[in-house]
Interface confidence: medium
């Protein structure tokens, strides 16, 4: 019995659902009562899901698997794996037995996009040409391990004095911290790129350092120039710092975080103590770091509605404030492609190709091209609908007149994450008889 599975690994984003395709060719007169279907982990032989004695025997794998019962009789033995985790990565074997027996293994490759890197500088003030500075590039919650690259403002790769560490959290996702030590010239731009080798997703950030003396007078409050990019559901740190003078104590500090536009209070520290979150109980300061001038705010379980500008007010004797922008993002799923009509196609027929990608933010850019890489812009209609959480589902429809055959590719780009997700369909028109 010939059992067919895809040669290439199935790539699935953490938290999404994946389909492990498996098919066989039922003979005439085949009935499900004859079918024994077993999915198991290839290495450990652990049972995942089974169908026997004419019945779906259910999931033996954390209740996260399902078959496609309506399609089994046509030879579709595919397995749906829900809410994919890093631990699911590996090989799954599909065993099919009717009269004969056959099996094949399909690989699941798990992936998660890395966040836009945040850049920090140490020391971050009173910098002069000739000073040595440490630039830290941090990117969060990606999988698998990232490749990290640095370069200067002229595009020259920087490989010396770079130390990169990658730590996996409880879910197996990696936080990447790459440290570059440089001696300052008159000024300089330093860029860090974090690349996900599976998703071919690049996330990069730059810092431009202009050595100079800090102005005196009011409290100098420092926040990142670039927006802080946070994935929906993750935690974000809105960085804010000030320079405490000798003899500074927390009793002197008034710290207020508020929404820049509406002035709504978010979090405060006054009279020597943390006054707590005034923002859905999802914010926290870093109390142990306040005395060193770290007034950063932690925002937990980020939602689309959190996007916007937050102002950090610091008052000691003098007063200073600065605003930091939060840009929320969510990766788009790999597009699914559908064809209408999808059979008995002939050259000259008009077909509608729909490219659908789900649960991303912000709105996507959608591009189409043919097999020669030529952009297709005519006869394209794209709609984007936000769900209750503010995440967008994208549906882009291309109408084409078939040639002898052709490949049509759709790319859904998340402009914030610089994440590209694409799907292709190859149509081979049947010649006229």
């Amino acid at each position: 019995l010939e059992v067919q599975v895809p040669e290439d690994p199935v790539v699935a984003l953490v938290g999404t659902d994946a389909t492990l395709c498996c098919s066989f060719s039922p003979e005439p007169g085949f009935s499900l009562a004859q079918l024994n279907l077993i999915w198991q982990l290839t290495d450990t032989k652990q049972l995942v899901h089974s169908f026997a004695e004419g019945q779906d025997q259910g999931s033996a794998y954390a209740n996260r698997t399902a078959l496609f019962p309506d399609l089994l009789a046509q030879g579709n033995a595919s397995l749906r794996l829900q809410r994919v985790r890093v631990a699911d990565e590996g090989s799954f074997t599909c065993f099919v037995s009717i009269r004969d027996f056959g099996s094949a293994a399909v690989s699941l490759q798990v992936a998660a996009p890395y966040s836009k890197p945040s850049m920090t500088l140490e020391p971050n003030k009173d910098l002069r040409p000739g000073d040595t500075v440490t630039i830290t590039c941090s990117s969060y919650q990606g999988y698998p391990e990232a490749e990290v690259f640095w370069q200067d403002g002229q595009g020259v790769p920087l490989t010396g004095n770079v130390t990169t560490s990658q730590m996996a959290n409880e879910q197996g996702l990696f936080d990447v911290h790459s440290i570059l030590r440089v001696v300052l010239g008159a000024n300089g731009t330093y860029s860090c790129l974090v690349r996900n080798p599976v998703l071919q997703q690049d996330a990069h950030s730059s810092v431009t350092i202009t050595p100079q003396r800090s102005p005196t007078g009011a409290v100098e409050v420092q926040v990142p120039e670039d927006p802080v990019v946070a994935l929906v559901g993750t935690d974000a740190t809105l960085r804010c710092s000030f320079s405490p003078e000798p003899g500074f104590s927390l009793a002197q500090l008034n710290l207020i975080w508020q929404l820049t536009d509406t002035k709504q209070l978010v979090h405060s520290f006054t009279e020597g103590r943390d006054q707590g979150s005034a923002y859905a109980n999802r914010t926290a300061l870093f109390p142990d770091l306040l005395a060193q001038g770290n007034a950063s705010l932690r925002l937990q379980r980020v939602r689309v509605a959190d996007e916007g500008s937050f102002t950090c007010f610091v008052s000691i004797r003098d007063f200073g404030s600065a605003a930091v922008s939060l840009q929320v993002a969510a990766p788009y799923s790999k597009p699914s492609m559908t064809l209408e009509p999808n059979k008995d196609l002939r050259p000259g027929d008009t077909v509608t190709i729909t490219c659908s990608s789900y649960r991303g933010y912000p709105e996507a850019e959608v591009f189409w091209q043919d097999g020669q890489g030529v952009p297709l812009t005519g006869n394209v209609t794209t709609s984007q609908m936000a769900n209750e959480q503010g995440l967008f589902d994208v549906h882009s429809v291309l109408r084409v007149v078939l040639g002898a055959n052709g490949t049509y590719s759709c790319l859904v780009r998340n402009p914030v994450l610089q994440q590209d997700a694409h799907g292709s369909v190859t149509i081979t028109g049947q010649p006229m008889t």
């Epitope: 403002g153 002229q154 595009g155 020259v156 790769p157 490989t159 690049d202 990069h204």
Partner: antibody
Framework: EVQLVQSGAEVKKPGASVKVSCKAS????????MHWVRQAPGQGLEWMGG????????TYNQKFKGRVTMTRDTSISTAYMELSRLRSEDTAVYYC??????????????WGQGTTVTVSS | DIQLTQSPSSLSASVGDRVTMTCSAS?????MHWYQQKPGKAPKLLIY???KLASGVPSRFSGSGSGTDFTLTISSLQPEDFATYYC?????????FGGGTKVEIK
């Protein structure tokens, strides 16, 4: 159409200087770093350095430091490469080449047609 | 500096042949790029980031490899493919090219 058009062939005497120009068209000149690569007769390719047209920052191959100067004139979308104290082994075809647009594209996607520089007494 | 050694330095092949050439780096690099150059012409980008096909390049060209060993393959040699091929790295400054592989008609 994206194009890099270089100045014509030059014949120079040893010890002289040569300045080769490269005019860009079909794209925004300041958005791509421009590099220079040379090729001696019957030999391979040798990287000389590059210039960021946006702010004029340069990077040079150590081998040419002190002899090569790269400049640009953004008003006419032109990059220049000047090589001084010429010697016979500098006889080569000199190419300008555009670095890929993304910051971390470390390859050259568009090349000029080349300028032949002959150094002979 | 990272040295790139291409082999063979030249090869003879016929139209339709499968042709493979290699580029070996003196230390590990992140990506390799490949160019094609015909006599009297400027080089042309063929493959970038080890395995990605440059715009307009036929799919018979492919690249692979990692670390120090990289390969350029032409699956079915065509008359217009007779040329010299160069590899290039810039994972570590300075940027360097290989010495080239010349593909000639048998």
């Amino acid at each position: 159409e994206v194009q890099l058009v270089q100045s014509g062939a030059e014949v120079k005497k040893p010890g002289a200087s040569v300045k080769v120009s490269c005019k860009a068209s079909g794209y925004t000149f300041t958005e791509y770093i421009m590099h220079w690569v040379r090729q001696a007769p019957g030999q391979g390719l040798e990287w000389m350095g590059g210039i960021n047209p946006n702010q004029g920052g340069t990077t040079y191959n150590q081998k040419f430091k002190g002899r090569v100067t790269m400049t640009r004139d953004t008003s006419i979308s032109t990059a220049y490469m000047e090589l001084s104290r010429l010697r016979s082994e500098d006889t080569a075809v000199y190419y300008c080449a555009r670095k890929g647009k993304d910051y971390f594209d470390w390859y050259f996607d568009v090349w000029g047609q080349g300028t032949t520089v002959t150094v002979s007494s | 500096d990272i040295q790139l050694t291409q082999s063979p330095s030249s090869l003879s092949a016929s139209v339709g042949d499968r042709v493979t050439m290699t580029c070996s780096a003196s230390s590990s690099v992140s990506y390799m790029h490949w160019y094609q150059q015909k006599p009297g012409k400027a080089p042309k980008l063929l493959i970038y980031d080890t395995s990605k096909l440059a715009s307009g390049v036929p799919s018979r060209f492919s690249g692979s490899g990692s670390g120090t060993d990289f390969t350029l393959t032409i699956s079915s040699l065509q008359p217009e493919d007779f040329a010299t091929y160069y590899c290039q790295q810039w994972s570590s400054a300075p940027l360097t090219f290989g010495g080239g592989t010349k593909v000639e008609i048998k």
